[in-house]
């Protein structure tokens, strides 16, 4: 788990964009809002995040949706799907 640290001045993410690829793990944790991530999941797969970075993003989504991801998020998982465990998938209420 990434240690919680304050987001550096000027680095708070206003949108999910390619600049985030250059954020370190702790910066992603501190500077990316989980709700923003959830509403812009369609952008995540277009950005070549490393799996180390995707672990951080998954952790943020897990905190936001402890009971399982909504369909709007599941539809846009892309590479993040490869990080899902059977336990994660069992929580999904997919119609």
């Amino acid at each position: 788990e990434v240690e919680k640290t304050a987001c550096p001045s000027g680095k708070k993410a206003r949108e999910i964009d390619e600049s985030l690829i250059f954020y370190k793990k702790w910066e992603l944790e501190a500077c990316v809002d989980a709700a923003l991530l959830a509403t812009q999941m369609d952008r995540v797969n277009a950005i070549p995040f490393t799996y180390e970075q995707l672990d951080v993003l998954k952790h943020k989504l897990d905190e936001l949706y402890p009971q399982g991801y909504p369909e709007s998020v599941i539809q846009h998982l892309g590479y993040l799907f490869l990080k899902m465990s059977p336990e994660d998938i069992r929580k999904w209420n997919v119609t």
Epitope: P48, T50, Y51, L82, K83
Partner: nanobody, 118 residues
Framework: QVQLVESGGGLVQAGGSLRLSCAAS????????MGWYRQAPGKERELVAV???????LYADSVKGRFTISKDNYTNTLYLQMNSLKPEDTAMYYC????????????YGQGTQVTVSS
């Protein structure tokens, strides 16, 4: 398992150029993202350049306009052309590869040292 072997580092004066190479053990057509990291003594590792399919390039602000990432699909080699080098570019440079099929590993090479003297 993917092996990455870097070369091309060395000592150069400020304002000079170097070209780093990274030889991959598999066809890089199978690799959907590759990049160069660097780590200076006592500092965190930072990503400086990325190339993703199909040949889309991204650069950290600190190297934009000075560094160019490219790859050769025939020799399975990743490059980093570094121009207008500064003393603050001194670091160990590492090649990395990820998004290889369904493999969820981020692969790294052993690194090559770049030292820029003033």
């Amino acid at each position: 398992q993917v092996q990455l072997v870097e070369s091309g580092g060395g000592l150069v004066q400020a304002g000079g150029s170097l070209r780093l190479s990274c030889a991959a053990s598999i066809s890089i057509r199978r690799i959907n993202a590759m990049g160069w990291y660097r780590q200076a003594p006592g500092k965190e590792r930072e990503l400086v350049a990325v190339i993703s399919s199909p040949n889309k390039t991204l650069y950290a602000d600190s190297v934009k306009g000075r560094f160019t990432i490219s790859k050769d699909n025939y020799t399975n080699t990743l490059y980093l052309q570094m121009n207008s080098l500064k003393p603050e570019d001194t670091a160990m440079y590492y090649c990395s590869a990820w998004r290889i099929g369904v493999d969820t590993t981020d692969y790294y090479g052993q690194g090559t040292q770049v030292t820029v003297s003033s």
